[in-house]
Amino acid sequence: ACNTATCVTHRLAGLLSRSGGMVKSNFVPTNVGSKAF
């Protein structure tokens, strides 16, 4: 797991998984208009 100051800060903010990898933003959509429907 990542224990650098940056990783600790990000983990507290909920941006990192326990393994230290970035967590995906759980499908908060970006660029919606580039996708058809």
Partner: antibody
């Protein structure tokens, strides 16, 4: 298999409100936005807006602000659209459509506004 | 808002004929924001082409799309009876998203 099942036809009086539903199945409901589209009889398509079920964020066509309200219920994987202060101009088929390039649309809900 | 003007409004074609429908935007848009839909009578629309030139899943290869800026087109390489429908372009570049007024394709 992805499916969007919309609620049945509605016949309502002018001035009333109506809330129609779009039940999603076959995919993770919070993984795509849900669009709503209006089609008057014999006419073209008009985008109303979309809702992001993950965080209930919405974007509206300015024309439909104050007319349409989009909501969703994650527990039942259902998107809703409420239309208020109905007039004959609101008589149309309303479609929900899953955002993405895979082309999933509901079958449409027919709304008739008549006294 | 971005206005999409389709041409022609209606057309009739013979089986086997090549068809081209155009979509002109009132402002320049990136091709990733331009999509095409097909709507058969009594049915919901379905996406044919997304991002100007990408064929949607299950769509026959006789359909193709191209264009950039303010000028886009949908082509049917060889018209078939099952292609009778109304075709719409749609832009997702700016809100409100808008559709073209539609091109009704009939068979001779």
């Amino acid at each position: 298999e992805v499916q969007l099942q919309q609620s049945g036809p509605e016949l309502v009086k002018p001035g009333a409100s109506v809330k129609m539903s779009c039940k999603a199945s076959g995919y993770t409901f919070t993984s795509s936005v849900m669009h709503w589209v209006k089609q008057k009889p014999g006419q073209g398509l008009e985008w109303i807006g979309y809702i992001n079920p993950y965080n209930d964020g919405t974007k509206y066509n300015e024309k439909f602000k104050g007319k349409a309200t989009l909501t969703s219920d994650k527990s039942s994987s259902t998107a809703y659209m409420e239309l208020s202060s109905l007039t004959s101009e609101d008589s149309a088929v309303y479609y929900c459509a899953k955002g993405g390039n895979d082309g999933y649309w509901g079958q449409g809900t027919t709304l008739t506004v008549s006294s | 808002e971005i206005v999409l003007t389709q041409s022609p409004t209606t057309m009739a074609a013979s089986p086997g004929e090549k068809i081209t429908i155009t979509c002109s935007a009132s402002s320049s848009i990136s091709s990733i924001y331009l999509h095409w839909y097909q709507q058969k009578p009594g049915f919901s629309p379905k996406v044919l082409i997304y991002r100007a030139s990408n064929l949607a899943s299950g769509v026959p290869a006789r359909f193709s799309g191209s264009g950039s800026g303010t000028s886009y087109s949908l082509t049917i390489g060889t018209m078939e009876a099952e292609d009778v429908a109304t075709y719409y372009c749609q832009q997702g570049s700016t809100i409100p998203f808008t559709f073209g007024s539609g091109t009704k394709l009939e068979i001779k």
